[in-house]
Amino acid sequence: LKGQEFAPSHQQVYAPLRADGDKPRAHLTVVRQTPTQHFKNQFPALHWEHELGLAFTKNRMNYTNKFLLIPESGDYFIYSQVTFRGMTSECSEIRQAGRPNKPDSITVVITKVTDSYPEPTQLLMGTKSVCEVGSNWFQPIYLGAMFSLQEGDKLMVNVSDISLVDYTKEDKTFFGAFLL
Amino acid sequence: LKGQEFAPSHQQVYAPLRADGDKPRAHLTVVRQTPTQHFKNQFPALHWEHELGLAFTKNRMNYTNKFLLIPESGDYFIYSQVTFRGMTSECSEIRQAGRPNKPDSITVVITKVTDSYPEPTQLLMGTKSVCEVGSNWFQPIYLGAMFSLQEGDKLMVNVSDISLVDYTKEDKTFFGAFLL
Amino acid sequence: LKGQEFAPSHQQVYAPLRADGDKPRAHLTVVRQTPTQHFKNQFPALHWEHELGLAFTKNRMNYTNKFLLIPESGDYFIYSQVTFRGMTSECSEIRQAGRPNKPDSITVVITKVTDSYPEPTQLLMGTKSVCEVGSNWFQPIYLGAMFSLQEGDKLMVNVSDISLVDYTKEDKTFFGAFLL
């Protein structure tokens, strides 16, 4: 199509056109997590701010009860950063009797839930051992990729330890998705 | 709209269409930072290469004086990676008298400046404690997310310690944005 | 163009329009790497799953022999995450005779190959020293940015040590690109 004059009567496209401004989009930011009941054998899900500050949802992309609800089928770019902070982990101590310690770790998972599927699907995982020598440590895990989603799919962010999530600033921990 | 034949007389869109190729876009790459005066109480801003090698700006997205200038309102995906390198940090020493040391850290912030606002807005922050045992350490911090920006907004990348930024290669430290 | 009614006879665009759904896109996921011959003085390239599970290629974006083949010129967002895992590196041992050890490191490079160029171009690099105190360590390196690519360009992901790549789960190690 390079350099070719646009003419409505000679439209070289293979599917209906779509204005970019009306595509489903969301950027959610961290809020303090209140203690809640989590599913057994599943990392706890974070809940999010969806309208204050930098956070927004638009064009039928809705946030409800820890989930982003996908309003139409298509390819989405999905991303999240979670900043963790904690105290020195045990694995940084001198290893006793030559027996190496199992490292502590931090993990973020972006999960897709489809009502017709019994099991959630893990789309993205960032996992890191934490063996810091200093007393207080902090670090982010960033994830982002493109996935084909169906209308009605739900997205959430799960973390290995909800009490280590840095909830202090909206620019440190966030979650978003947009239709490509 | 799936599988439906496109016809100009039956255009199912809700806003004016826009060719993707003319959207504002930029990818900036690292250059060596020379000692300069920084604003008090603010992390120093990096300056960037905007036309050589992999770097480019296009479609009215301009780079000037450490800032990317947003030429039109809309939702932008903004990203940056900064690779830091340094020597062993003090917090990796044996903790004296049981008193834990405050860890050294590295931080990247993507900041938005709006002329009508007195204060810059921090859009994204990646911050990490550095307690390395080896002599030379190096590591990247990556950030990326979507934000609603207004025409005239300016974006910059600030870092906690400008002298630790790895400026040797354009693929290690970079900054970009594109209109969705 | 804000708020203006769309009319085919009054199309305010500067280039031919393009339906989003037919743009080249791919998301590739990790598979176990089989030992192969690598180019001298170049990090080994990973090979990928391109159709099972979360992986897909579409709209003429093809995967073949470790490469993503770019089917049309334009600006692409390219991303990858590689999760590494290994045993304690030597540099975490007590430094003998006051001589600091050279740190081990892990590196990911997204590389572009253009047939008319003799040398590959490194688009993105994430590199990190590894000086872990615990016995087993694991951590991801994430990269993503926008580049102007030409039809026929080929993309690959190279890593410093293929034997340290975590190939166990498709959400831990992945590679993707999409036309903007």
């Epitope: - | 930072q33 000692p35 020597m87 002298s163 630790l164 290669k169 | 050279k102």
Partner: antibody, heavy 118, light 107 residues
Framework: QVQLVQSGAEVKEPGASVKVSCKAS????????MHWVRQAPGQGLEWMGW????????NYAQQFQGRVTMTRDTSISTAYMELSRLTSDDTAVYYC???????????WGQGTMVTVSS | DIQMTQSPSSLSASVGDRVTITCRAS??????LNWYQQKPGKAPKFLIY???RLQSGVPSRFSGSGSGTDFTLSISSLQPEDFATYYC?????????FGPGTKLEIK
């Protein structure tokens, strides 16, 4: 513009100490590492060490360990290098230098000649 | 410590000549290699960083290349003001070390 202005020439006896100052202007003093490099007459360049003006942290070359002390006064944007137990081998021009990154030297002072002679 | 060697130690050339100076590190220093120019009685001047990237304000007749252990500094067409001593310096790890220098003289 960025400038480093060093103190004047010194003549010292063996066994004495010398303290050279380096006043910085035109940039944020605490944001960039300050290095000290010396050059004996007719010889090459020898890195002595650095100070991080923000934290006061230092890194000295092994051959100067125990003899050199680098300090700074952020209120007057000045770095200092003190070398003790001087011998005739320490006769040299001493430069302060600042880098945009910690591993290189963008801007140099004019140099301070230190002569050690009995 | 990383040792830096330079060759030649001195070099005679004429205005307009192309000259090349080599620098070798005793172990890999990646691209953390800098070049300086020094004239008699003056402080060194920073020329090239990251092995191949020209410092702002340095004429384009200067160029650098190399990675790992072997590096070169080239001057494409010598000008009268280029006659000086050139030093390489590794910034990979401390102690930072300089090469012994190459003295470029007028033939």
């Amino acid at each position: 513009q960025v400038q480093l202005v060093q103190s004047g020439a010194e003549v010292k006896e063996p066994g004495a100490s010398v303290k050279v100052s380096c006043k910085a202007s035109g940039y944020t003093f605490t944001a960039y590492y300050m290095h000290w490099v010396r050059q004996a007459p007719g010889q090459g360049l020898e890195w002595m060490g650095w100070i991080n003006p923000k934290s006061g942290g230092t890194n000295y070359a092994q051959q100067f360990q125990g003899r050199v002390t680098m300090t700074r006064d952020t209120s007057i944007s000045t770095a200092y290098m003190e070398l003790s137990r001087l011998t005739s081998d320490d006769t040299a021009v001493y430069y302060c230098a600042v880098g945009g990154s910690y591993d290189a030297f963008d801007i140099w002072g004019q140099g301070t000649m230190v002569t050690v002679s009995s | 410590d990383i040792q830096m060697t330079q060759s030649p130690s001195s070099l005679s050339a004429s205005v307009g000549d192309r000259v090349t100076i080599t620098c070798r590190a005793s172990q890999s220093i990646s691209s953390y290699l800098n070049w300086y120019q020094q004239k008699p009685g003056k402080a060194p001047k920073f020329l090239i960083y990251g092995a191949s990237r020209l410092q702002s304000g340095v004429p384009s007749r200067f160029s650098g290349s190399g990675s790992g252990t072997d590096f070169t500094l080239s001057i494409s067409s010598l000008q009268p003001e280029d006659f000086a001593t050139y030093y390489c310096q590794q910034g990979h790890s401390t102690p930072f070390t300089f090469g012994p220098g190459t003295k470029l003289e007028i033939k």
